[in-house]
């Protein structure tokens, strides 16, 4: 069998491999050692017994989308059946005091690989044997502690594979300089040690995307905006736009990034090198926000001028399909597509990212102020309580609801929240009466709201002791 027979549904073409060469990966036309690494089709009954106590699930994630030329990282995490975990030695053990369907286990081990390797490795201390090899026959790398790594991960994409020895979690990074733009499929097959051979325990696949567009996301924040995710904002208050560039491999770290904004309200273009910008819309309506992000990033070098035409034919396919930044480029002859550009050329290319949103601007409550607080005289039966009247004004649209949140002096521990509808005239002047139980200092958050906005003001007030000699106190 060949790797593509084992790892994929369809044999990838040489064309696919040649056009997507991944540095350090191998062709899936290579032979797979089926004696050491048995191959089971989906639905094979042997899968049921591939792991003690249930099935292992592999979860494959990536930090896709990746800007072409950057690195994309894939992570595989193994999820074991209930009550099982990997210990510090790489063995699979039962968690203490954890009950599964089989009850508590007397044997602490699900798989005691340490004992197996100590007992059965007659290798004259070399640490190498015919079975400590990957499916293509390459020997395991002998990192310190490699014997505690009991899972073999085979990654497969674009007609190539990459083998990795690991524990219950592994990561693999791939440079995308030579990857065709668009969605691609990564497949991973996981094997575990089993005596002097290996047993498949999980298969997983995931789509990743390589793009020549900078992946851009914009968060928008506006004070008093009731719902920041509905792209409806308030007139006459600044909106803060914050641009997030998805660049997990820091490919653009040394790039100068320019942000070109068009807010759609005839205020012209605004160009900045800052990822945040504030803009205030002064009219109601619907506006088309457009952002173009530009970064000079490492990129392909333009082809050299064609050499003088030879009189005799030259070998075909003299092209560059290896990574420009490959640290260890193999000889050009390794490859049906020869290297015809200098690997360490450092060229720049402008990369662009785009973000577009439709923003709705409406009237809202712009500001709220407490202009007066008055201690209301209470009848004698309630000596412990104080009533305070807050006289409040607002600007902007007319509120429909008022809420007061009474907290401790640090404004952290809420003691009481009261909301009530309000009926306010166009002058926007209202009195809010609230009860305070006992003397002391309180933090009062007062909000006025309508459908689209929520305006807040805060104050600290001191409620004095009730003194019959001074029944009425003004709060400060």
């Amino acid at each position: 069998k060949r790797f593509h027979d084992v790892l994929g549904n369809e044999r990838p073409s040489a064309y696919m491999r040649e056009h997507n060469q991944l540095n350090g990966w191998s062709s899936d036309e290579n032979d797979w050692n089926e004696k050491l690494y048995p191959v089971w089709k989906r639905g094979d009954m042997r899968w049921k017994n591939s792991w003690k106590g249930g099935r292992v699930q592999a979860v494959l994630t990536s930090d896709s989308p990746a800007l072409v030329g950057s690195n994309i990282t894939f992570a595989v995490n193994l999820i074991f059946p209930r009550c099982q975990k990997e210990d510090a030695n790489g063995n699979i053990v039962y968690e203490k005091n954890c009950r599964n369907e089989a009850g508590l286990s007397a044997d602490p081990y699900v798989y005691n690989w340490t004992a197996w390797s100590e007992d059965s490795d007659g290798e004259n201390g070399t640490g190498q044997s015919h079975h400590n090899v990957f499916p293509d026959g390459k020997p395991f790398p002998h990192h310190p502690g490699w014997r505690r790594w009991n899972f073999i991960y085979v990654f497969h994409t674009l007609g190539q594979y990459f083998q990795k020895l690991g524990r219950c979690s592994v990561r693999v990074s791939v440079n995308t300089a030579n990857v065709t733009l668009g969605p691609q499929l990564m497949e991973v097959t996981v094997y575990r040690r089993h005596g002097r051979a290996y047993v498949p325990i999980a298969q997983v696949k995931d789509v990743y995307v390589v793009t020549d567009q900078i992946p851009v996301f914009v968060t928008m924040f506006q004070k008093n905006d009731r719902n920041s995710s509905d792209e409806t904002f308030l007139k006459d208050l600044p909106i803060m736009f914050d641009v997030l560039i998805h660049d997990p491999s820091h490919f653009l770290n040394y790039s100068t990034i320019n942000y070109k904004w068009s807010f759609g309200d005839n205020t012209g273009l605004f160009v900045s090198t800052n990822h945040t910008v504030n803009h205030t819309y002064v009219l109601n309506g619907t506006f088309s926000l457009n952002l173009t992000v530009k970064a000079a990033a490492p990129g392909p070098c333009p082809p050299p001028p064609p050499p003088p035409r030879p009189s005799k034919p030259t070998p075909s396919l003299a092209t560059t399909l290896k990574s420009y930044d490959s640290n260890t480029p193999g000889p050009a002859g390794d490859n049906p597509l020869e290297l015809s550009r200098i690997p360490d050329e450092n060229c720049q290319i402008n990369r662009y990212g785009h973000f577009q949103a439709t923003i709705t601007i409406v009237e809202g409550i712009l500001e709220v102020n407490i202009i007066q607080m008055t201690d209301v005289l209470m009848p004698v039966p309630w000596p412990e309580s104080s009533l305070i009247d807050f006289v409040v004004t607002c600007q902007g649209s007319i509120p429909t609801e008022v809420c007061t949140i009474i907290s401790d002096p640090t404004c952290e521990i809420t003691q009481n929240t009261v909301c009530s509808p309000v009926d306010v005239d166009e002058m926007c002047l209202l009195t809010v009466r609230r009860t305070f139980n006992g003397s002391g200092t309180y933090c009062v958050n007062l909000t006025l709201g309508d459908d689209t906005s929520l305006a807040l003001t805060s104050t600290l007030i001191s409620v004095p002791d009730r003194d019959p000699a001074s029944p009425l106190r003004m709060a400060n």
């Epitope: 040489a14 040649e18 392909p300 092209t319």
Partner: antibody, heavy 119, light 107 residues
Framework: QVQLVQSGAEVKKPGASVKVSCKAS????????MHWVRQAPGQGLEWMGE????????NYAQKFQGRVTMTVDKSTSTVYMELSSLRSEDTAVYYC????????????WGQGTLVTVSS | DIVMTQSPDSLAVSLGERATINCKTS??????LAWYQQKPGQPPKLLIY???KRYTGVPDRFSGSGSGTDFTLTISSLQAEDVAVYYC?????????FGGGTKVEIK
């Protein structure tokens, strides 16, 4: 929708060069390799080579190596194929064709450009 | 280079009858084989890719089969509009190569 529009017919003398253009629209130009295929009158299809508009990598069929040059103008989403040292057997219809992702089959073709080489 | 041998060179079939075209490759290209239809004065039109996958909008009377080095295009019930030249193409490796073509006519 995807469209590939080629330049008009050409008549050339032996020894001369011809440059055929193929203007692409309806898709992200830099995302797909563009190929050139020719067809002599009454004959079959013959692959000449391909170019990646993203980085201008090229692969040429051995038969045309040294005589063909494929180039790109990203600003106009146009691919060019120049064939030099023309001879009478180069008389053919020249097609540009777009591959699909990692697969070299052609769902989209230009309308073809007839190049006649005659003294 | 991978050599493509198409047979027969021409084929005359009655309307409504089955037409079968064969394509043999000089090495295993499975499943990277496509079929095209070409009518006079027009560019080729993709029918089948990856040996058996029908391209969008292609009538289901066209089907592809085969693996390894032997592939077949079948028109299950020939229609008048199917009169054309049919080409196979391997998309397994560069240089891409085409079969010599099969001319399909109505008997």
């Amino acid at each position: 929708q995807v469209q590939l529009v080629q330049s008009g017919a050409e008549v050339k003398k032996p020894g001369a060069s011809v440059k055929v253009s193929c203007k692409a629209s309806g898709y992200t130009f830099t995302s797909y390799w563009m190929h050139w295929v020719r067809q002599a009158p009454g004959q079959g299809l013959e692959w000449m080579g391909e170019i990646n508009p993203y980085d201008q990598r090229t692969n040429y069929a051995q038969k045309f190596q040294g005589r063909v040059t494929m180039t790109v103008d990203k600003s106009t989403s146009t691919v060019y194929m120049e064939l030099s040292s023309l001879r009478s057997e180069d008389t053919a219809v020249y097609y540009c064709a777009r591959s699909t992702g990692n697969y070299a089959w052609f769902a989209y073709w230009g309308q073809g450009t007839l190049v006649t080489v005659s003294s | 280079d991978i050599v493509m041998t198409q047979s027969p060179d021409s084929l005359a079939v009655s309307l409504g009858e089955r037409a079968t075209i064969n394509c043999k490759t000089s090495q295993d290209v499975s499943p990277s084989l496509a079929w095209y239809q070409q009518k006079p004065g027009q560019p080729p039109k993709l029918l089948i890719y990856s040996a058996s996958k029908r391209y969008t909008g292609v009538p289901d009377r066209f089907s592809g089969s085969g693996s390894g080095t032997d592939f077949t295009l079948t028109i299950s019930s020939l229609q008048a509009e199917d009169v054309a030249v049919y080409y196979c193409q391997q998309h397994y490796s560069i240089p891409l190569t085409f079969g010599g073509g099969t001319k399909v006519e109505i008997k």
